[in-house]
Interface confidence: low
Amino acid sequence: NLGEVVVAEVGWDALKLNWTAPEGAYEYFFIQVQEADTVEAAQNLTVPGGLRSTDLPGLKAATHYTITIRGVTQDFSTTPLSVEVLTEEV
């Protein structure tokens, strides 16, 4: 399973996401960026399995997001880990 997910940096339009996972265990990571308290569709993103950090740009200022990450192999997906974050005001 995934270890932990941490929002390392927060800006008004972007954030940096870090996570831990066993080396070589996953082909890619599936990340959902969901604006909290809205019915807007989540942005579904994938990240190469070698990465443990990624920037998430294109966000709205002063907005509450729920970010969920899963590790994926060809036939398996981990239990999701989630983190909530409020982007900075402009």
């Epitope: 890619y28 993103l45 994938t46 190469p48 399995g49 070698g50 294109g58």
Partner: antibody, heavy 121, light 107 residues
Amino acid sequence: QVQLVQSGAEVKKPGSSVKVSCKASGGTFSSYAISWVRQAPGQGLEWMGGIIPIFGTANYAQKFQGRVTITADKSTSTAYMELSSLRSEDTAVYYCARLYGYAYYGAFDYWGQGTTVTVSS
Amino acid sequence: DIQMTQSPSSLSASVGDRVTITCRASQGIRNDLGWYQQKPGKAPKRLIYAASSLQSGVPSRFSGSGSGTEFTLTISSLQPEDFATYYCLQNGLQPATFGQGTKVEIK
């Protein structure tokens, strides 16, 4: 099956600009980053920059900052790379490559066929 | 930028030989490294991702190992179709950087 199809060869004069296109099919275009990599004759591979269509944000290698512009049109699943102020050393094959996932850089798993750009007076 | 030093720059080998190519990163990149094969006039083809994971459809004679700063691509028994140029690519830190390539030629 994912396919990246690039525009045809170009011959350009020094000081001019070139715009190369890369049309993706067979996958979800917006969620995957497209990078551009070039290869000068007889030389190695060099990452130029990339774009995440879902956000429209591009990122560039320092070497090309200010000279390259990478854009994407989600409606046509096409990415573009424009290089300005061309010089003879920009003569190269330019490849687009789709990352396995969301990042500006990474493990390039699908490649276009390459577009030869020749800069000559 | 991270420098990727690949060695040797070229090698001559015979069909059936075991071939090893090394890539050294100027700083630690965990296992964020891929290996690519390129034939003349063609786009590169990924063989290995995450240092040691075999790309789907790639023959099992190709293998990768290493972590941190030292990485190796091994071809256990060289086949005629393996004569090509091989590149490593680090994707641990931006910008992505390639090794300078290793040309594998017929002895």
